[in-house]
């Protein structure tokens, strides 16, 4: 047992098995489920993370799977394919054949259909609202205050560069936190909205996903913040395809 | 816990070479970053790039240097930076230093080596 | 995004102080590294995190500032602090930016 050994960890991703037997001995950890490598230096892709998730023990899981039937609080857990990127794959199918499109967070843009459904492309999720509500406090927040502390939130634990974080809105106790990331804006090595919103929910749910890491300790001012609902929104950069009858129920 | 640098000398204008930062005392296989950092003579100091060298092998450039520059990190033990069409504006003492966090945005040098010159000239 | 540190010299008696200043044109909250580099050696952190001092720096070197705003002060001035000091940030290095400030140097009379 090495000092190696201890050293490798994968401190963004805890859902992974590591070890130094990459090239020349290095560090390389593993998503479960998938068995694909992840590179622990930034965010894991929602897409492994989900399969990494449902791969885990049904003991493991924390949260119960809402019903098909359920509008509210859907988790939208399912056991979804990955491509060699890591990214969901456009077509999405379950064990009975039935299958949708998805958008680049993995949140179905379509009606479900049989295998013969076509899903041309991945549509870029690029804008993402996440909506909160915080738990009554003394006073209002300072909006300024909230405003840099979620933005060195997002850099600092979720390495989005600050110029995603597109506006942050406060009216007590909603706040809004409005993410925007174009396909030309989006370079490699840029933290994807999608991941640094999921990694963001998992920590307001109090499920960490960083290794070995305390939970999300949110303060404005050293008052803290702690959010009792959250709702996110997703915006594709193609509208989504329903049928009228989902629309009109 | 040490770093040394080595590959440094006089190169010929257009010219390339390639240095090698070794660790002794600890291993390159941890959840940190390696930088190169240059300082040509009488002036300050630029980084030229960094490396995770946990799992993933993430590389950032400075804007200057992409295209030019190639680090990389194939063993627990090293890590290197090629240079390419060298020009006597690369002259300088170029360091390696160890960041202190797995968070490349949030790193600071708590370890460097002595340095090694690099002499660009005909 | 730059870092400007100022002034690029000083020259203060031993038993003194000299402050050093460092502004980012971005808030890079309190991520924030000073160093001491003497001719001919690498540089050594004396500060991160804007005030936390790294280990075996003497409480004479204090770090201060968050956001946009950052001071280095060296107080009881010794001959030994003679030397270049430089802040430095990686917030911003996906915008391949340099992240060192100017330098400083210190002369103590």
């Known amino acids: 047992h090495t000092a190696a050994q201890d050293n490798c960890t994968c401190p963004t991703n805890k859902m992974t098995v590591c070890s130094p037997d990459g090239p020349g001995g290095r560090c390389q950890c593993r998503a479960l489920g998938s068995g694909m490598a992840v590179d622990c230096s930034t965010l894991t892709s929602k897409c492994l993370l989900l399969k990494a998730r449902m791969s885990a023990p049904k003991n493991a899981r924390t949260l119960v799977r809402p019903s098909e039937h359920a509008l509210v609080d859907n988790d939208g857990l399912y056991d979804p394919d990955c491509d060699p990127e890591g990214r969901f794959k456009a077509r999405q199918c379950n064990q009975t054949s039935v299958c949708w499109c998805v958008n680049s967070v993995g949140v179905r843009r379509t009606d479900k259909g049989d295998l013969s459904l076509r899903c041309d492309e991945l549509v870029r999720t690029h804008h993402i609202l996440i909506d909160l509500r915080h738990r009554p406090t003394a006073g209002a927040f300072n909006h300024s205050d909230l405003d840099a502390e979620l933005r060195r939130l997002f850099r600092e634990r979720y390495r989005l560069h600050p110029k995603f974080v597109a506006a942050v809105h406060y009216e007590q106790p909603t706040i809004q936190i409005e993410l925007r990331q174009n396909t030309s804006q989006k370079a490699a090595g840029d933290v994807d909205i999608g991941d640094a919103a999921y990694y963001f929910e998992r920590d307001i749910k109090g499920e960490s996903l960083f290794q070995g890491r305390g939970g999300l300790d949110l303060r404005v001012r050293g008052e803290p913040l702690q959010v009792e609902r959250t709702l996110i929104y997703y915006l594709d950069e193609i509208p989504p395809k329903f049928s009228m009858k989902r629309l009109t129920a | 816990q040490q770093l040394e640098e080595s590959g440094g000398g006089l190169v010929k204008p257009e010219g390339s070479l390639t240095l090698t930062c070794k660790g002794s005392g600890f291993d390159f296989s941890g959840t940190y970053w390696m930088w190169w950092v240059r300082q040509a003579p009488g002036k300050g100091l630029e980084w030229i790039a960094p490396i995770y060298v946990g799992s993933g092998s993430s590389t950032y450039y400075a804007s200057w240097a992409k295209g030019r520059f190639t680090i990389s990190s194939t063993s627990s033990t090293a890590v290197t930076l090629q240079a390419t069409s060298l020009t006597a504006a690369d002259t300088a003492t170029y360091f390696c230093a160890r960041g202190a966090t797995n968070n490349v945005f949030m790193n600071y040098f708590n370890l460097w080596g002595p340095g090694t010159l690099v002499t660009v000239s005909s | 995004f730059e870092m400007t540190q100022t002034p690029s010299s000083v020259s203060e008696p031993v038993g003194g102080t000299v402050t050093i200043k460092c502004q980012a044109s971005e808030d890079i909250s309190s991520n924030l590294g000073w160093y001491q580099q003497k001719p001919g050696q690498p540089p050594k952190l004396l500060i991160y995190?804007?005030?936390t001092l790294a280990s075996g720096v003497p409480s004479r070197f204090k770090g201060s500032g968050s956001g946009t705003e950052f001071t280095l002060t060296i107080s009881d001035l010794e001959p030994a602090d003679a030397a270049t000091y430089y802040c430095?940030?990686?917030?911003?290095?996906?915008?391949?930016?340099?992240?060192f400030g100017g330098g400083t140097e210190v002369v103590v009379k």
């Open positions: 430095q940030t990686s917030y911003y290095i996906d915008d391949g930016v340099n992240g």
């Open positions: 995190g804007a005030s």
